[in-house]
């Protein structure tokens, strides 16, 4: 089995020819002994050891000796340059045929079949694995929400999928799967996904099955996820050097005295699996996932924590029914640290 990737340049074929006596044959000298190889066009003869033993046209002829003596043994090492293996190549077949002018009637051709496992190369990376966010203010019920700004602070994860180099041309689909922390274990919202956009040669939305993206049909914000009020504007986090200082949060002020982690692996969060097909393009594809921290859940259930960390996973994989095409899954984590907004408690009034 050939584990083939584009890094494979040479293929070495080792052939042992012997003329030994057997119970049927006494093992005479073989005159004009010749080995003929018929190779596919994907393989180009590169070198032979011993040097000069073989000549190549469409077929490769290797002179073994005249005569090839009784009890003689010969090893041929033939190197091929791999020039034409594609995703469509299922196997490479080389036919070997021994011949001699001496009498031997059982020299059947031998077929060597090399199954090709074609390994695709691609990559998955993120602009920022860990985001910073916050919760605070007052609880708002679903029924009172009109726009995604009503939900909570914005999150934007950006995934980059490297080009494959060789197009799949209908042989499979590259898929980005997200294990998305959707709800906390009691069933309340956790990170509310608002939109997923794929940017390759053009941009289009990704809508995984199950109606799980913005299921409340809240109005999406204007480009740039513009905050809706001056109070929120001050707290909007902009890693790209936005206006004003970052929010003063309890976690920052108290060095994250009390933290908790919500992840699906521990059962403290419940995940949904969101899949987006990645276009077969020779360029880097960007996948942007926008979401909102569900503020009310954090106020109701996590108010005693200065910081809540939420973890998720993304996996890039190949979906194909062709067993000879492989791609190593690429997995990466993403997370968000959600800090409690600092509320300075005034000392109780002394009567």
């Amino acid at each position: 089995r050939l584990q083939y990737s584009r890094d494979v340049r040479k293929l070495l074929l080792s052939i042992n020819v012997t003329n030994t006596r057997t119970s049927e044959r006494s093992g005479e000298d073989a005159h004009e002994a010749l080995l003929t190889l018929v190779v596919p066009p994907a393989l180009l003869l590169s070198s032979v050891r011993p040097p000069g033993a073989c000549q190549a046209n469409e077929t490769i002829f290797c002179e073994l000796g005249n005569p090839f003596k009784r009890n003689q043994r010969m090893e041929l090492l033939i190197a091929f340059e791999v020039i034409g293996v594609t995703l469509h190549t299922r196997d490479l077949q080389v036919q070997l045929q021994l011949s001699t002018s001496s009498h031997q009637d059982n020299l059947w051709p031998m077929i060597l079949t090399l199954l090709v496992d074609y390994t695709l190369q691609t990559s998955l990376s993120m602009v920022n694995h860990r985001l910073q966010s916050f919760f605070g203010g007052t609880v708002m019920g679903e029924s009172g929400m009109k726009t995604v700004e009503d939900v909570g602070s914005p999150l934007k994860y950006e995934f980059q999928v490297g080009p494959m180099g060789e197009g799949l041309v209908g042989l499979g689909t590259l898929v980005l799967g997200l294990e998305w922390p959707y709800e906390v274990s009691n069933g309340k919202w956790l990170l509310y996904p608002t939109e997923i956009t794929v940017h390759g040669n053009g941009s289009w939305p990704c809508r995984p099955p199950g109606d799980l993206i913005n299921p409340l049909n809240l109005t999406l914000s204007d480009p740039g996820d513009r905050p809706s009020s001056p109070q929120r504007r001050r707290r909007q986090l902009d890693p790209g050097g936005g206006q004003g200082p970052p929010p003063v949060t309890l976690a920052a002020a108290k060095k994250a005295k009390s933290e908790t982690v919500l992840t699906c692996a521990t059962g403290r969060a419940h995940c949904v699996w969101l899949e987006c097909p990645i276009p077969d393009a020779p360029v880097v594809t960007n996948v942007t996932v926008k979401a909102r921290v569900w503020n009310s859940t954090f106020i109701e259930d996590y108010r005693d924590f200065d910081r809540v960390r939420v973890n998720g996973w993304a996996t890039l994989f190949l979906r194909t029914s062709i067993p000879t095409i492989n791609m190593e899954n690429k997995t990466t984590w993403f997370s968000v640290d959600i800090d409690s907004e600092l509320v300075e408690e005034l000392p109780a009034e002394i009567e």
């Epitope: 679903e142 069933g187 109606d211 799980l212 409340l216 419940h270 949904v272």
Partner: nanobody, 120 residues
Framework: EVQLVESGGGLVQAGGSLRLSCAAS????????MGWFRQAPGDQREFVAN???????NYADTVKGRFTILSDNAKNTVYLQMTSLKPEDTGVYYC??????????????WGQGTQVTVSS
């Protein structure tokens, strides 16, 4: 209003298997999540497994690898396939359905439950 009816409970020996069914009728909302919970005598009701309308599943650590939740959307039915049962799996198994994002205990619809007893 959604009604849920569980079936398939019973007495089974440790190491055995059972398949619970939960049939939903009435007006189902979408997207939804259906789940199985269980309650042993004197204990609180605890999460076992859930399945979202998109097919995503989650399991409690104690049942991972032994239990499988499946849904048949055409029949509005969710199943819990339980294998390698242990005495500690004994309890009343409840089916529940809710809108995504809502608390199970505040907003979920619940069935009457089906008793599962695993003897050693």
């Amino acid at each position: 209003e959604v009604q849920l009816v569980e079936s398939g409970g019973g007495l089974v020996q440790a190491g055995g298997s059972l398949r619970l069914s939960c049939a939903a009728s009435g007006r189902m909302f979408s997207p939804n999540v259906m789940g199985w919970f269980r309650q042993a005598p004197g204990d609180q009701r605890e999460f076992v497994a859930n399945i979202y309308s998109g097919g995503s599943t989650n399991y409690a650590d104690t049942v991972k690898g032994r239990f499988t939740i499946l849904s048949d959307n055409a029949k509005n039915t969710v199943y819990l396939q339980m294998t390698s049962l242990k005495p500690e799996d004994t309890g009343v198994y409840y089916c529940s359905v809710k809108r995504v994002g809502q608390s199970w205990f505040d907003s979920g619809y619940w069935g009457q439950g089906t008793q599962v007893t695993v003897s050693s």
